[in-house]
Each structure stands twice: as structure tokens, then as C-alpha cells.
């Protein structure tokens, strides 16, 4: 084989692998670990970029990545990997991660558009929202590893921040 990257050892937990390969998808093959934005294609015998299959039926092998990809296309939203959901920045401004900084800071500059609880926060009446208060503190992306299978695939700083939240 040439040009196509070998999979990385370690990398993903079994739980993550099961989420990416539901119902014993492509059985009879040792599951391989691939970088975050890739999946193991057992017929090709290599890691493949999830980007290539997000428009296919088979995107189930990359469900989380593909959801995050479509989520980032929506303004004022970001994909939360822990919740595995597309989150509206408007609902968390005030305790927002950096993915929402641009959206929330713009919102705060125009208080007319803010919901009452956020207007209260601006005037110092910050509610003690213990459910969310620490949920988004200190969120740092873990950095992007160059993809061995697709060395041409490089994520921009914005994309990295969103994909590796």
C-alpha cells in the first residue's frame, strides 16, 4: 500500500468505536483506531476522511463528525461533542465556549435582541445557574493531528475549534 495512512494505535475508546460502528458494522475485522475526523473502512483496509462520506447513506460510520459538519454551517450554533448535539449559542450566552464568542459578543452589544435573563446578567443580576456554570469553562481544543490517510486535509483554526470542542 502506498499513500494511504495506517491507523493509529490507541486513539479511541471501545465506546466511541461502537458509536461509529453500530450493529456490528463490518464485522469480522479488527476495529482500527483512526484520527478523530476519520473512520476505518474495512473494505479499503485504511482510514478514510469522514468528510468524503457525509453525503452518503453510510455516514453512520461518521455520524458525530457529519453532524458537527452540518451544524457548523448553521450560524450561531456549534457542535458539542460531549452532548453529541448541535447547540444554539443564543441559549448559552453568558457561560458560552469560545465557539460562541463571536455570536454572543455581538448579541451583548445589541441588548435589544437579548432575552430578559441575559439582559439581567448584563446589569449585574447574574443568576446562579449551577446546571450550566462550569459546563463550558476552560474549553480548549486538543489540537488537530495531520491526517495520515488524507494528508491534504487540513482544518482551519475555526474548524479545529469546532471539531475538537
Amino acid at each position: 500500500m502506498s499513500g494511504l495512512g495506517r491507523s493509529r494505535r490507541g486513539g479511541r475508546s471501545r465506546v466511541d468505536q461502537e458509536e461509529r460502528f453500530p450493529q456490528g458494522l463490518w464485522t469480522g475485522v479488527a476495529m482500527r483506531s483512526c484520527p478523530e475526523e476519520q473512520y476505518w473502512d474495512p473494505l479499503l483496509g485504511t482510514c478514510m476522511s469522514c468528510k468524503t462520506i457525509c453525503n452518503h447513506q453510510s455516514q453512520r460510520t461518521c455520524a458525530a463528525f457529519c453532524r458537527s459538519l452540518s451544524c457548523r454551517k448553521e450560524q450561531g450554533k456549534f457542535y458539542d461533542h460531549l452532548l453529541r448535539d448541535c447547540i444554539s449559542c443564543a441559549s448559552i450566552c453568558g457561560q458560552h465556549p469560545k465557539q460562541c464568542a463571536y455570536f454572543c459578543e455581538n448579541k451583548l452589544r445589541s441588548p435589544v435582541n437579548l432575552p430578559p435573563e441575559l439582559r439581567r446578567q448584563r446589569s449585574g443580576e447574574v443568576e446562579n445557574n449551577s446546571d450550566n456554570s462550569g459546563r463550558y469553562q476552560g474549553l480548549e481544543h486538543r489540537g488537530s493531528e495531520a491526517s495520515p490517510a488524507l494528508p491534504g486535509l487540513k482544518l482551519s483554526a475555526d474548524q479545529v475549534a469546532l471539531v475538537y470542542s
Epitope: 499513500g3 494511504l4 463490518w26 473502512d41 474495512p42 479499503l44 468524503t52 452518503h56 490517510a149 488524507l150
Partner: antibody
Framework: QVQLVQSGAEVKKPGASVKVSCKAS????????MHWVKQKPGQGLEWMGY????????KYAQKFQGKVTMTSDKSTSTVYMELSSLTSEDTAVYYC???????????WGQGTLVTVSS | DIQMTQSPSSLSASVGDRVTITCRAS??????LNWYQQKPGKAPKLLMC???RLHSGVPSRFSGSGSGTDFTLTISSLEQEDFATYYC?????????FGGGTKVEIK
């Protein structure tokens, strides 16, 4: 609609090389893996290898290592399959086939007959 | 490599007949079994993928079943254009492998 158009039939002498082309249209060329399949006259289908046009990554069947070289040209959405040191065993129809990421080959070229004869 | 064995290698049938072709894998391939139809001088065409999912444009008289190692392709009522050679292919494990083919001829 998806189309894979292959180059015409070739007649070659033993020891020579041949390069077969497969021009893709109707989809994003770099998003799909292209495979090549060999079919000897009156026989079944034999998988040879594949190329990922995104980065020209290739993987060949063990049997074809050293015999086949696959390349692609993104500017013309064309993949190439070159066979070297031809013998009569290489006389066959060669097909390019697009991989659908579900384990199957959803679209095929019309085939290129390569005849090796002295 | 996974071996794919098709049976019968050929069969004779008439228009309107129900035809069944079987394909056996040498090891478990889950449901990653595909069927192709090939007519003389033409390229193979994908009929069905993932055991029973019809490819676009394929008539509903074709159906597939099975899982693990044993699979069948059924043509409920054979039509003139169905006389061809049929190949199975496993899509579960590298490298992809094909069955030897089943030729459906006119009786």
C-alpha cells in the same frame, strides 16, 4: 448523472506496457475511491486495486503488486491504470468501478479490452 | 482472503420462472453482500447492495436475503432481459472478492 468512460481497446506485444484511462463525470471526482477489476475472456471478476484521487493513495491486490500502477489527474477527473511487462495472462477486459462507501461498486466503466499477442 | 462460492454455476429457465441463486462466504460477512448483473460484452451493473437494498432503477422482481455466510438472490418472475450472468461480492473485509458467477440461460 454519474458516468465512467474508459479508453479504447489496445493490442500490445509481450513485454510492453499499456495505460488504460477512465474519465469520471457527474460527481465530485476527489470524493470517491476508484477501483479496477480484471475479467479474462469467459471468466469471472477479479479485484486489482484502488486509487483515492484525493491524494493519489493506492492499494493493490497482492497478485498485482509490481504489475499495476494506478494514478489520477484531478484536472481532467481521470484515473489511469498501467500494466507493465505484459504477457498473454494480461489479456482481459479491465473495468474501472466507483466505490460507494457501503462495500459495493455502484458505477462501472464500459471496460477496455487489452490483448497481448506477438 | 474471503472466498465466495456461487451455485449453481449455470441454470436454464423460462420467462416467468422463479429463479434463486445462492452465494456462500468462507467466513461471516454480516450483511455486506452485493449482487451484480452482467450481460455479454457489457460491464457489470450493481443490482443490490447490503444483501437486500435494490440499487436505483433495479426492478422489484429482484430480491435478496441472508446474513453471515449464506445469501440468496431471487428473481420472482424471470423476464427476457434478466438472462445474464450474476456475481456476488463481499464488501465486509479487505480485499473485496467476487463469486465465480451464475449464468442464467434460456431453457
Amino acid at each position: 448523472q454519474v458516468q465512467l468512460v474508459q479508453s479504447g481497446a489496445e493490442v500490445k506485444k509481450p513485454g510492453a506496457s499499456v495505460k488504460v484511462s477512465c474519465k469520471a463525470s457527474g460527481y465530485t471526482f476527489t470524493n470517491y475511491v476508484m477501483h479496477w477489476v480484471k475479467q479474462k475472456p469467459g471468466q469471472g471478476l477479479e479485484w486489482m486495486g484502488y486509487i483515492l484521487p484525493y491524494n493519489d493513495g493506492t492499494k493493490y491486490a497482492q497478485k498485482f503488486q509490481g504489475k499495476v500502477t494506478m494514478t489520477s489527474d484531478k484536472s481532467t477527473s481521470t484515473v489511469y491504470m498501467e500494466l507493465s511487462s505484459l504477457t498473454s495472462e494480461d489479456t482481459a477486459v479491465y473495468y474501472c468501478a466507483r466505490y460507494d462507501y457501503e462495500g459495493s461498486f455502484d458505477y462501472w466503466g464500459q471496460g477496455t479490452l487489452v490483448t497481448v499477442s506477438s | 482472503d474471503i472466498q465466495m462460492t456461487q451455485s449453481p454455476s449455470s441454470l436454464s429457465a423460462s420467462v416467468g420462472d422463479r429463479v434463486t441463486i445462492t452465494c456462500r462466504a468462507s467466513q461471516d460477512i454480516s450483511n455486506y453482500l452485493n449482487w451484480y448483473q452482467q450481460k455479454p460484452g457489457k460491464a457489470p451493473k450493481l443490482l443490490m447492495c447490503y444483501t437486500s437494498r435494490l440499487h436505483s432503477g433495479v426492478p422489484s422482481r429482484f430480491s435478496g436475503s441472508g446474513s453471515g455466510t449464506d445469501f440468496t438472490l431471487t428473481i420472482s418472475s424471470l423476464e427476457q432481459e434478466d438472462f445474464a450472468t450474476y456475481y456476488c461480492q463481499q464488501g465486509n473485509t479487505f480485499p473485496p472478492t467476487f463469486g465465480g458467477g451464475t449464468k442464467v440461460e434460456i431453457k
